[in-house]
């Protein structure tokens, strides 16, 4: 059987505070617990929710939590169900409300000497006790002319007189707390001799040099006095007018007329009514001078056909608030339809091309009128004038691809090459009309090109294939001067390309035929063994059918390549002595020798007194210093080849001889002695 270890119990609770109804069960099998409120299952909310088996209240609510709660435990498998004892809350609360007139039925019926009853609509549990106030002062029960009924929460004034006039409020307190009236009641019982407002002046806005009228009336017995004052407390009468109010007239009924209003007349006007008794009544009204500022400029707008767009017209600052309307072609727009005005907005629904044009926003008030134009362009999808065509472009010449389109506004054209956007550079240029110029066509320009023409309304694109017509050319052009090593094998290559594969052949410039040991193998001139007679001028001729022939002239020199007869050696010299680095080379043509010391070429004309290069190529350095140490390179070159060899130079301090060493003792390393 299911047994309740803890059952919920009825308890006091405070409105808006936490509470917990406990429930704990013990059962042989698994059970689930749910709660009922007045027999209906309780749904979890953030405010009231199951916490384990118990029911937790984050904030007790006197309306939603009134009733009987019951904890139900159910074994879903067996269907057994057990129910706890019922529990409910005694919820303590207090809630503010207004002070209302209970008797008579309406304020209009309140007359001097009638009974007036006010009710305080503060409620609570337990029932609170009430305190009444007039103009913030507590009213004690049993005072003359009023009675307080706490049970009915009423305050009765009998008979009510002018002395009872004032602001009535109430407060109530109970064990839960306290609250004061949310809305108070102003009781006004007129004293006939007090001035009362019949007609109050209203703020007015007038244009410069127009007239303004303020109305003001009071009533009392006997009749009250009425006086007008301007801002600086200057009285305005028909006999004494301030200098700046020369055109002011006060009428017998109390109205004030101002004619030809100027800026200095703007300000606050006070109408003061004074009865035989009671305080003066001061009514204020302001005279404003109408004004209107300029309107901000519109940016031109581009819209797409078929869409819905809005253009907002911000009215200029002005007094009174300027009215705004839209016009097109001199006609005011309607408030409904396809192109219409909604509030300050121009609305274009399902835009057509014919809607393009100038629309004008007008703003006007008493001070004048302002207008501002907005230019509306209806964008169209571009259409083709000329699509790019598959083209054959000549290598080395400028090439053009057309992309001519038309649309509103003028379309933007971009080009892609192999799906990559072409950015304008020295080789590519896009003209204003969309045509692409390739400044000097190269072989690898033969690919797909795509142009895209766009407006805000959409885009069109087309592509074309470019085929490059290769010019007949040597690839690469043969070097015009070449050397061959005497008595060795040599080759001179010559290759060319063109629209058709060219035929390549060599011939001697003088027209004589090639000797038998020289062969022409598909453009490569082959010398089995170079002789002196092989030197001379040769011509490589490349030709094909459509492009004719081209020639390249080559001067072949036969040379004995450079060899070193004497090479510089690793040298160590005492500081202040002379160093000699020998170098001698041979070859044909006879090689020239240059020296490089410490990574710079030694110019024979700028060597100075310490250095000298001999005719045979040797380098001498006098009075060597430590900074002369380093690697020295001998470079031998002629018109056919160049060769180099290097050796280090070490400059060392001369040792001071010790006594044990005789004058004939050898130095510790190989030296040049000078």
């Amino acid at each position: 059987a299911i047994v309740f270890i803890k059952q919920p119990s009825s308890q006091d609770a405070l409105q808006g505070r936490r509470a917990l109804l406990r429930c704990e069960v013990e059962a042989p099998g698994p059970v689930h617990v749910y709660w009922l409120l007045d027999g209906a299952p309780v749904q979890d909310t953030e405010r009231r929710f199951a916490q384990g088996s118990s029911l937790s209240f984050a904030a007790v609510d006197r309306l939603q939590d009134s009733g009987t709660f019951q904890c139900v435990a159910r074994d879903d498998v067996t269907g057994e169900e057990a129910r706890s004892a019922n529990a409910s809350f005694n919820i303590k609360w207090i809630e503010a409300g207004p002070v209302v007139l209970k008797h008579p039925a309406s304020e209009a019926e309140i007359q001097p000497q009638t009974q007036v009853t006010l009710r305080c609509h503060i409620d609570g549990h337990p029932r609170p006790t009430y305190q009444w106030f007039r103009d913030g002062t507590p009213l004690s029960d049993g005072q003359s002319n009023h009675t307080v009924s706490s049970k009915e929460r009423n305050l009765t004034l009998r008979p009510a007189g002018p002395e009872h006039s004032g602001l009535y409020s109430c407060c109530a307190h109970s064990a839960f707390g306290q609250a004061c009236s949310s809305q108070n009641f102003t009781l006004s019982i007129a004293d006939e001799s007090f001035a009362r407002v019949v007609l109050a002046p209203q703020d007015v806005v007038v244009a410069r040099y127009e007239e303004a009228m303020f109305h003001c009336q009071f009533s009392a017995q006997p009749p009250p006095s009425l006086q007008w004052l301007f801002e600086d407390e200057t009285p305005i009468t028909n006999r004494s007018r301030p200098p700046h109010l020369r055109r002011a007239t006060v009428f017998a009924n109390g109205s004030l007329l101002l004619t030809q209003v100027r800026p200095r007349n703007a300000g606050i006007y006070r109408c003061i009514g004074q009865g035989q008794r009671g305080p003066p009544i001061i009514l204020e009204a302001t005279l404003h001078l109408a004004e209107i500022e300029d309107m901000p400029l519109f940016e031109p707008r581009v819209f797409t056909a078929g869409s819905e767009e809005r253009v907002t017209c911000l009215p200029p600052k002005g007094l009174p608030e300027p009215s705004v309307w839209w016009e097109h072609a001199g006609v005011r727009l309607p408030t409904h339809g396809r192109v219409y005005q909604k509030g300050h907005e121009l609305v274009l629904a399902n835009i057509a091309e014919s809607d393009a044009g100038v629309y004008t926003c007008h703003a006007a008030n008493l001070a004048g009128q302002r207008r501002q134009d907005v230019n509306i362009t209806v964008a169209t999808v571009p259409s083709w004038l000329k699509k790019p065509q598959d083209s054959q472009l000549e290598e080395g010449k400028p090439g053009y691809l057309d992309c001519l389109t038309q649309a509103t506004p003028k379309p933007t054209v971009v080009w892609y090459r192999n799906q990559m956007l072409i950015s304008e550079d020295s080789r590519f240029e896009v003209f204003k009309n969309g045509t692409l110029r390739i400044n000097s066509v190269e072989v690898y320009d033969g690919t797909w090109y795509r142009c895209m023409s766009s407006t805000p309304a959409g885009s069109i694109e087309a592509q074309a294939r470019v085929q490059v017509l290769e010019k007949l050319k040597f690839t690469p052009p043969p070097q015009p001067q070449q050397c061959m090593e005497f008595d060795k094998e040599a080759t001179v290559p010559c290759s060319a390309t063109g629209r058709e594969k060219p035929t390549i052949k060599w011939e001697r410039a003088d027209g004589s035929s090639l000797p038998e040991w020289v062969t022409d193998n598909a453009g490569t001139l082959h010398f089995a063994r170079v002789t002196r007679d092989d030197a001379g001028n040769y011509t490589c001729i490349a030709s094909n059918g459509p492009q004719g022939q081209i020639r390249a002239h080559v001067q072949l020199t036969v040379a004995v390549f450079i060899t070193f007869k004497v090479e510089p050696e690793r040298t160590t010299v005492y500081q202040g002595h002379t160093a000699l680095l020998q170098c001698e080379a041979q070859g044909d043509p006879k090689p020239l020798i240059q020296w490089k010391g410490k990574d710079r070429i030694l110019d024979p004309t700028k060597l100075g007194p310490r250095m000298h290069i001999f005719q045979n190529g040797s380098l001498v350095i006098h009075d060597v210093a430590p900074e002369d140490s380093g690697r020295y390179t001998c470079i031998a070159g002629n018109s056919c080849n160049i060769k180099h060899t290097e050796a280090p130079l070490y400059v060392v301090d001369k040792p001071v001889p010790e006594e044990s060493e005789g004058p004939g003792s050898p130095p510790p390393y190989k030296m040049i002695q000078t």
């Epitope: 698994p30 689930h32 299952p41 879903d76 067996t78 269907g79 057994e80 169900e81 129910r83």
Partner: antibody, heavy 112, light 110 residues
Framework: EVQLVESGGGLVQPGGSLRLSCTAS????????MNWVRQAPGKGLEWVGI???????YYASWAKGRFTISRDTSKNTVYLQMNSLRAEDTAVYFC??????WGQGTLVTVSS | EIVMTQSPSTLSASVGDRVIITCQSS????????LAWYQQKPGKAPKLLIY???NLASGVPSRFSGSGSGAEFTLTISSLQPDDFATYYC??????????FGQGTKLTVL
């Protein structure tokens, strides 16, 4: 022995009424919840409603208004009153205590 | 209206196979775990297999197991036996004492 026996099924014309009974033995209804479940021929199980230990009833949305569950604790019997019957109400009607204990079912045929 | 969807509606398998049936609810069940699984054979009343999502009913073999929470649940048969070919139903219990069944999954021999 704890068991449930349904009765009252049979043939009824469309628009007619029928009251099914589920008699419990071996336990007291006042401590248990009782379900009615039906199964149309060749179709799946469909929950009709429940009566809890206090006698409060809850129904599937489609059953509200036409079907009423009640009980007589002195007779230890639960009832299913079915009104305005339609052809689609043809099914075997089971009563069940909790999830575990089920009756053998009674067939209701609605046909003209 | 609460809708409980079982998948698949029909399932063919062989003895020894591992079988998984899923049950998805249009809203969470009470306490996130008040879900039961039944087995029914033709002409018989349904038999309780699993209650409270994963608790095995008395006398049910341990090859049956259940899991899930909230609105998504599964029934697993770890190694199918000849006696297991039947129709399986999930049943949810919802806030407000409302119950609902899935449309059923018919398990047949491959």
């Amino acid at each position: 022995e704890v068991q449930l026996v349904e009765s009252g099924g049979g043939l009824v014309q469309p628009g007619g009424s029928l009251r099914l009974s589920c008699t419990a033995s071996g336990f007291s209804l006042s401590n248990y919840v009782m379900n009615w479940v039906r199964q149309a021929p060749g179709k799946g199980l469909e929950w009709v409603g429940i009566i809890d230990s206090s006698g409060s009833t809850y129904y599937a949305s489609w059953a509200k208004g036409r079907f009423t569950i009640s009980r007589d604790t002195s007779k230890n019997t639960v009832y299913l009153q079915m009104n305005s019957l339609r052809a689609e109400d043809t099914a075997v009607y089971f009563c069940a205590r909790g999830l575990y204990l089920w009756g053998q079912g009674t067939l209701v045929t609605v046909s003209s | 209206e609460i809708v409980m969807t079982q998948s698949p509606s029909t399932l063919s398998a062989s003895v020894g196979d591992r079988v998984i049936i899923t049950c998805q609810s249009s809203q969470s069940v009470y306490n996130n775990n008040l879900l039961a699984w039944y087995q029914q054979k033709p002409g018989k009343a349904p038999k309780l297999l699993i209650y409270y999502t994963s608790n095995l009913a008395s006398g049910v073999p341990s090859r049956f197991s259940g899991s899930g929470s909230g609105a998504e649940f599964t029934l697993t048969i770890s190694s199918l036996q000849p006696d297991d070919f039947a129709t399986y139903y999930c049943q949810g219990h919802y806030n407000g004492n409302i119950y609902a069944f899935g449309q059923g999954t018919k398990l047949t021999v491959l």
